[in-house]
């Protein structure tokens, strides 16, 4: 049966036993800046092109043991959430991966900047259709990272990022605080903000909307046919990247402002229990859970 | 995220190092009255001191970025400091990434075309 997260983003009139928009997002390229990925996993084979871009810091600790499946875990799962054959949102989207996070899931602002610059140069060398850039990472507020995101957005690229998993104001983190970036918080199957250990999803006025981000089934790098459940604002951002890819594939001329407006318009309103947020943040945090449009032009999204 | 917000720095630290009057032998002095600023991550454990992104003013060309980076290296060498240019940015933002001692920040902030300098910091999978 359909995983809860795919059901949640699917308008009721399209719900069936399975979620299957076969070519959703086929005109769009999604760039993923994350860990290395297992690109030939059955769920994503042929859908993800691993670029030769790699800019990661060394792993911490003298006795760190580099295990391939662990190194690939985060990125493989997210690639599956965006475009996986069976558990992905935009099953027609093609992806390109850049490695900016090491085997411990750690990267640098400078490495991310160089990755964003790589994307811009690729776009100039070989202009394609609409581009979505997924940044499932967060660091402290960074003027330079936000500035780079702004420049890329002004070049027509849609950037989607994780709000952060610090149960804190997203405005204190980057790229979540960049105004031009679509910043995504995480909710669960009960439309509650996601709790992650002692922390949880970030919130506040720098968040644009929420999306499923708890117990999300996706490709596991443990084996070529394995699936695993992961949680976080990265998973939530991957849903929105997939939805954005489907919207842009249906309407390639959409501007960033129009896309943002559509994402908000088609979101489920006032379903999140705001009591979870600090009192002073409740009015500032958008009560929106992302969903696909219940398009009257069915073929736009589901052909 | 969330368009329409003011650009808020939150806890973000901004250290403004005022420019001294003597130009330290620079051929091209920065425009009168402009102050390049230094930024670093407010979360101490995430800081990566020793690596800095030198961001140049918007219209700076690649050749000027390279020249500014070389000038920093030359001036640092005169003071007995080794520096390494790790990357020259162009396409999105003009500037360069440099590995150097924090002692050289004041010098770097006085270079021509410099808009601001940011200390590198960590980002994490979410």
């Amino acid at each position: 049966s359909i995983p809860w997260n795919l059901e949640r983003i699917t308008p009721p009139r399209y719900r069936a036993d399975e979620y299957q928009p076969p070519d959703g997002g086929s005109l769009v390229e999604v760039y993923l800046l994350d860990t290395s990925i297992q690109s030939d996993h059955r769920e994503i084979e042929g859908r993800v092109m691993v670029t030769d871009f790699e800019n990661v810091p060394e792993e911490d600790g003298t006795r760190f043991h580099r295990q391939a499946s662990k190194c690939d875990s985060h990125g493989t799962h997210l690639a599956g959430v965006v475009s996986g054959r069976d558990a992905g949102v935009a099953k027609g989207a093609s992806m390109r991966s850049l490695r900016v996070l090491n085997c411990q899931g750690k990267g640098t602002v400078s490495g991310t900047l160089i990755g964003l610059e790589f994307i811009r140069k690729s776009q100039l060398v070989q202009p394609v259709g609409p581009l979505v850039v997924l940044l499932p990472l967060a660091g402290g507020y960074s003027r330079v990272l936000n500035a780079a995101c702004q420049r890329l957005a002004r070049a027509g690229v849609v950037l989607v990022t994780a709000a952060g998993n610090f149960r804190d104001d997203a405005c204190l983190y980057s790229p979540a605080s960049a105004p031009e970036v679509i910043t995504v918080g995480a909710t669960n199957a009960q439309d509650q903000p996601v709790t992650l250990g002692t922390l949880g999803t970030n919130f506040g006025r720098c968040v644009d909307l929420f999306a499923p981000g708890e117990d999300i089934i996706g490709a596991s790098s443990d084996c070529s046919t394995c699936f695993v459940s992961q949680s976080g604002t990265s998973q939530a951002a991957a849903h929105v990247a997939g939805i954005a890819a489907m919207m842009l594939s249906a309407e390639p001329e959409l501007t960033l402002a129009e896309l943002r407006q559509r994402l908000i318009h088609f979101s489920a309103k006032d379903v999140i229990n705001e009591a979870w947020f600090p009192e002073d943040q409740r009015v500032l945090t958008p009560n929106l859970v992302a969903a696909l449009p219940p398009s009257t032009h069915e073929n736009l999204y589901f052909q | 995220g969330a368009m329409g917000q003011e650009d808020e720095d939150g806890d973000y630290e901004e250290l403004v190092l005022a420019l001294r009057s003597e130009e330290d032998g620079l051929a091209e002095a920065p425009e009168h009255g402009t102050t390049a600023t230094f930024h670093r991550c407010a979360k101490d454990p995430w800081r990566l001191p020793g690596t800095y992104v030198v961001v140049l003013k918007e219209e700076t060309h690649l050749s000027q970025s390279e020249r500014t980076a070389r000038r920093l290296q030359a001036q640092a060498a005169r003071r007995g400091y080794l520096t390494k240019i790790l990357h020259v940015f162009h396409g999105l933002l003009p500037g360069f990434l440099v590995k150097m001692s924090g002692d050289l920040l004041e010098l770097a902030l006085k270079l021509p075309h410099v808009d601001y300098i940011e200390e590198d910091s960590s980002v994490f999978a979410q």
Partner: antibody, heavy 115, light 109 residues
Framework: QVQLVQSGAEVKKPGASVKVSCKAS????????ISWVRQAPGQGLEWMGW????????NYAQKVQGRVTMTTDTSTSTVYMELRSLRSDDTAVYYC????????WGQGTTVTVSS | QSALTQPASVSGSPGQSITISCTGT?????????VSWYQQHPGKPPKLMIY???NRPSGISNRFSGSKSGNTASLTISGLQAEDEADYFC?????????FGGGTKLTVL
Amino acid sequence: QVQLVQSGAEVKKPGASVKVSCKASGYALTSYGISWVRQAPGQGLEWMGWISAYNGNTNYAQKVQGRVTMTTDTSTSTVYMELRSLRSDDTAVYYCARGYGMDVWGQGTTVTVSS
Amino acid sequence: QSALTQPASVSGSPGQSITISCTGTNSDVGGYNSVSWYQQHPGKPPKLMIYEVSNRPSGISNRFSGSKSGNTASLTISGLQAEDEADYFCSSYTSTSMVFGGGTKLTVL
């Protein structure tokens, strides 16, 4: 263009081993693994297993597990399938195909097991 | 015994439409979006005609279409032509492997 080129026909005695090669070209090798499929004379298709061109991981069908070994040589973009302890019912055409999706196939290698 | 059940043979006249069924369980056909159909002419390797239930690879005629309902997938060939005479195999993911149907011989009368 995307191509999978296999090694030539083999005749083997029962109990022997056979090693079939499959050279891939024309695509990003790490984006797909290689599946091996066999077809006995006049019969249907049987999936034997898969190997990752990315990290060499394998996934073997239960029926041949323990007798089959798939390996990869990334320097030559070649994948190998070795089947040991051959029996007469292993007589078949052996195909390599791209990925689990099997969208591109090699020309096939006939393996005859006969005493 | 193949894991997926197909009719041994079907036939049709030129111009007609035919449908080949492929029945599995909810552990294969019913559980995944990844049902494929292959055409095989004698002495040749199989050729992918439909992937992921209903998608056609580039270069495949739109006379070929695929669908799925529950645990049964179907391949429909419309406007039957002489060159469509061949064996047709379905395949599906299972949790850890791949399974094929036993094959259907299509005869164009």
